[in-house]
């Protein structure tokens, strides 16, 4: 008898009653497996359930496939042994007899697996599409809600204006929009959503309460509030919205009148610095991050804003890569690659009268309030708003001039009634936009302060001389820690030393201006500058401490600025005639530090504590300060430029070159210290009372150097 398969473990041997078992056993098992997929219907519920069911089915099929392949392998072996003349036992023979069946099953299982895999992919695609659709819908809803909040805050803000109140009471065509009681209700509600600073509460707690009120209003809840319900208040507010009162022409829109825009357009060409710096390497790498820039579109001259572009009214995130690239390709003077002490020395400037005239021209061109988002909306600590979901617009590539780094905010009184000792106010003071091209990766560590509004009347909270004090820059500390990562930098909240002011200005050397990040890229037209000595600066309106990685081998001499001449004016522009508004970048990132881009230290003006009724000019900018975690808190911090930061990338932050990436936005450390106040709009001049007792804090309460715990 041929040598049997007795030793080959694969076979099953049956000489006695050799079992036809192979088939019976294993086939049965296979059958059971095969049945499994049928019973595992893909769940029709949520995507997750479907995916899970599909996984299970695929798992069963996969297991079945493996079993069949294993079995087929055995059968092949049996057959081979049979061919060699070896005897198989009954189980093996039974198995071999099932060879065709196993082969067919295997093919079927493979086909089944392919089908289910395709189905699984389809399901995944569908789930992703659905999720994306849902996400978009959620974002849309969030956006709508945010828009509503902004509208609501705008309306509530506007109700501080007597003229608006009167108009709403009289109504359009004699039909009143709001009654006196309804106005009072809204006034009461305003106090809840725009509360006076309560020092017994942490800021985020206070705004948490405020946000709950806003939320309940948006929901139109039946809960009682201010002697009525949120639902009633919502109806009142909706009535105001529907009246379209604020859409009509008597409203002072943010931006320039047409003739002003037309007049300011030529200024663009003149804005390009005529200095001849060695251009740094252009940074042209396309940013992969969908970034968002904050641009006050209405603030641009018409020639600069390409009206042909689709206005992205409802799109909140806008790719600005092309813009960024086009801006980055402007020649930039390379700054010396050695970190220098933060001292700025004076630069001879043109005739004071000429300079003053220039500034006034500049201000005249930039009339009109900014219609920016309330800071309360930006207090992300207790809200689920995505920081990227804030009205954004790409900058127009044609705007490649550097923007002035100064703000000339008007003075706002604490109450709606004019204060006797206010500094004279130009009714239409202007703001020049600040450029923010900073990174979170590196945070310059100058001491940070909360500069108070220079002329704001704060009832005996602090002496006016201290308010107007210029805060000197602590150079030692800055230099020492400038190359430290944000987390390791000291947080400094110290009152600035009082120095005599030149022309009531705030010294641009002051730490808040140098180390705080500015908020918006507002592409405002800037008047032409003709003085050659002024234009010889690296960039006329460059970010202070223009930190750049330059590939330039030699150091470029930085023009020195006189400390006295670096003053940004508070209130109306009282700057001495020789002020230059220029902060030349001479603080460089040390070349060896390439772990994160330095925070561009830009002048920063705190214009938040504007009380209602003041001149509206200063609404545009939002302040920030450093909290205990050394994270910059305030105005939209969290912009991360997505650029290569190699030392020779030639990236200078003064040009609007960094696309903003919100991916790393740490919401939890972010708190706005100030909400912007809403001064009275446009050329209405003096603050208005609200009829009856003054509501001192309809704008924002003043808070100075308050550290949030």
């Amino acid at each position: 008898m041929p040598s049997a398969t007795s030793h080959s473990g694969s076979g099953s041997k049956s000489s006695g009653p050799p079992p036809p078992s192979g088939s019976s056993g294993s086939e049965a098992a296979a059958g059971a497996g095969a049945a499994a997929p049928a019973s595992q219907h893909p769940a029709t519920g949520t995507g997750a359930v479907q995916t899970e069911a599909m996984k299970q089915i695929l798992g069963v099929i996969d297991k079945k496939l493996r079993n069949l392949e294993k079995k087929k392998g055995k059968l092949d072996d049996y057959q081979e042994r049979m061919n060699k003349g070896e005897r198989l036992n009954q189980d093996q023979l039974d198995a071999v007899s099932k060879y065709q069946e196993v082969t067919n099953n295997l093919e079927f299982a493979k086909e089944l697996q392919r089908s289910f895999m395709a189905l699984s992919q389809d399901i995944q695609k569908t789930i992703k599409k659905t999720a994306r659709r849902e996400q978009l819908m959620r974002e849309e809803a969030e956006q709508k809600r945010l828009k509503t909040v902004l509208e609501l805050q705008y309306v509530l803000d506007k109700l501080g204006d007597d003229e608006v109140r009167t108009d709403l009471k009289q109504g359009l065509n004699g039909v009143p929009i709001l009654s006196e009681e309804e106005l009072s209700l809204l006034d009461e509600f305003y106090k809840l959503v725009d509360p006076e600073r309560d020092m017994s509460l942490r800021l985020n707690e206070q705004y948490e309460h405020a946000s709950i009120h806003l939320w309940d209003l948006l929901e139109g809840k039946e809960k009682p509030v201010c002697g009525t319900t949120y639902k009633v208040l919502k109806e009142i507010v909706e009535r105001v919205f529907q009246s379209n009162y604020f859409d009509s022409t008597h409203n002072h829109q943010n931006g320039l009148c047409e003739e002003e825009e037309a007049a300011s357009a030529p200024a663009v060409e003149d804005q390009v610095p005529e200095a001849e710096p060695e251009p740094a390497e252009e940074y042209t790498e396309q940013s992969e991050v969908e970034s968002t820039e904050y641009v006050n579109r209405q603030f641009m001259a018409e020639t600069q804003f390409t009206s042909g572009e689709k206005e992205q009214v409802d799109e909140w995130t806008v790719e600005t890569v092309e813009v960024v690239n086009s801006l980055q390709q402007q020649p930039q003077a390379a700054s010396p690659s050695v970190p220098e002490p933060h001292s700025l020395t004076p630069v001879a400037q043109a005739d004071p009268l000429v300079r003053r005239q220039r500034v006034q021209d500049l201000m005249a061109q930039m009339q009109g309030p900014y219609n920016f988002i309330q800071d309360s909306m930006l207090d992300f600590e207790n809200q689920t708003l995505d920081p990227a979901i804030v009205s954004a617009q790409p900058m127009n590539p044609t705007q490649n001039m550097d923007m002035p780094q100064l703000v000339c905010p008007p003075v706002h009184s604490e109450s709606r009634l004019a204060q006797p000792n206010q500094v004279p106010v130009q009714p239409e003071a202007t703001q020049v936009p600040l450029v923010s091209s900073t990174s979170e990766g590196y945070t310059a560590s100058q001491p940070l302060y909360q500069p108070s509004h220079a002329t704001e009347q704060r009832p005996q909270k602090e002496p006016i001389d201290q308010i107007q004090a210029t805060i000197s820059l602590n150079t030692d500390q800055t230099t020492a820690s400038s190359s430290l990562p944000a987390a390791s930098q000291p947080q400094v909240f110290q009152a600035g030393t009082s120095k005599p002011l030149h022309s009531s200005g705030i010294n641009v050397n002051a730490a808040p201006f140098q180390s705080m990040q500015t908020v918006f890229n507002m592409n405002a037209p800037v008047p032409p500058v003709n003085e050659p000595e002024t234009l010889k600066q690296q960039n006329q309106y460059q970010a202070s401490y223009n930190q750049s990685f330059s590939s330039q081998p030699h150091q470029v001499e930085q023009t020195e600025l006189q400390q006295e001449q670096l003053q940004t004016v508070v209130g109306t522009y009282h700057g001495s005639p020789d002020q230059s508004h220029q902060v030349t970048g001479n603080h460089q990132q040390p070349p060896q530090q390439n772990t994160g881009f330095p925070r561009s230290n830009q002048p920063y003006y705190n214009s938040r504590g504007v009380s209602r009724g003041g001149s509206r000019g200063a609404r545009g900018l939002m302040n920030g300060y450093r909290g205990p975690a050394n994270g910059f808190r305030g105005g939209y911090d969290g912009y991360r430029p997505s650029f290569s930061n190699t030392p020779n990338s030639g990236y200078t932050q003064s040009q609007f070159s960094a696309p903003r990436d919100y991916s790393g936005y740490q919401r939890d450390g972010y708190q706005q210290n100030f909400k912007r106040g809403s001064g009275q709009s446009g050329p209405r001049g003096a603050p208005r009372g609200r009829g009856g007792p003054p509501r001192p804090n309809r704008g924002m309460p003043q808070m100075n150097t308050q550290q949030v715990n």
Epitope: M1, P2, S3, A4, T5, S6, H7, S8, G9, G11, S12, K13, S14, S15, G16, P17, P18, P19, P20, S21, G22, S24, G25, R87, L88, N89, Q90, D91, L93, D94, V96, S97
Partner: antibody, heavy 114, light 112 residues
Framework: EVQLVESGGGLVQPGGSLRLSCAAS?????????MSWVRQAPGKGLEWIAY????????AYANWAKGRFTISKDNSKNTLYLQMNSLRAEDTAVYFC??????WGPGTLVTVSS | DIQMTQSPSSLSASVGDRVTIKCQAS??????LAWYQQKPGKAPKRLIY???NLDSGVPSRFSGSGSGTDFTFTISSLQPEDIATYYC??????????????FGGGTKVEIK
């Protein structure tokens, strides 16, 4: 229905002979099967006797069965046989035929007694 | 001939108990082993083939393991209908090295 039915059992005197048959239905003897005979004495365990491979007629026997017992098949009749000679009292048992070791007949009783 | 030794020859257990039966071959038979259940007056019924493969229709409380010379049969949770005698059998094809399809002596399982 696939089944096996044994026949030919009964009372036989010691030293006598008996031929057991196992009729297969539901399947053909032309397949690849081992057909076996197994017996079980009253109150005792199972005891394998012999098998034949239907395909080529190869046989194997338990040592104790060699010489006295012969396994055979008739493909045309689909029948398996067990020829028992020189029966002894200890051969008294129920005799089962089996296809492989999965399918069994109900058995037929063989009693060897004088 | 190959010899199969089964132990214990009988056992008594309670319903729900785990029951284990051993079978030892006189020489290595790889995994060529089957386990049978036989109830009085009936033909044996194969439960396990190739040492560990469960026949179709057999409850999963029955299982087999082992290879070479030592094999184990287990009833994970004894049920009243499991009262029977259990046998092991070498199922190798007879050859010069392994001869015969010998059965073990059987194990009678009873309920306490």
């Amino acid at each position: 229905e696939v089944q096996l039915v044994e026949s030919g059992g009964g009372l036989v005197q010691p030293g006598g002979s008996l031929r057991l048959s196992c009729a297969a239905s539901g399947f053909s003897f032309s397949g690849s099967y081992y057909m076996s005979w197994v017996r079980q004495a009253p109150g005792k365990g199972l005891e394998w006797i012999a098998y034949i491979y239907i395909g080529d007629g190869v046989t194997a026997y338990a040592n104790w069965a060699k010489g006295r017992f012969t396994i055979s098949k008739d493909n045309s009749k689909n029948t398996l046989y067990l020829q028992m000679n020189s029966l002894r009292a200890e051969d008294t048992a129920v005799y089962f035929c089996a296809r492989g070791n999965k399918l069994w007949g109900p058995g037929t009783l063989v009693t060897v007694s004088s | 001939d190959i010899q199969m030794t089964q132990s214990p020859s009988s056992l008594s257990a309670s319903v729900g108990d785990r029951v284990t039966i051993k079978c030892q071959a006189s020489q290595s038979i790889s995994s060529y082993l089957a386990w049978y259940q036989q109830k009085p007056g009936k033909a044996p019924k194969r439960l396990i083939y190739d040492a560990s493969n469960l026949d179709s229709g057999v409850p999963s409380r029955f299982s087999g393991s082992g290879s070479g010379t030592d094999f184990t049969f287990t009833i994970s949770s004894l049920q009243p209908e499991d009262i029977a005698t259990y046998y092991c059998q070498c199922t190798a094809v007879s050859s010069a090295t392994i001869y015969g399809n010998a059965f073990g002596g059987g194990t009678k399982v009873e309920i306490k």
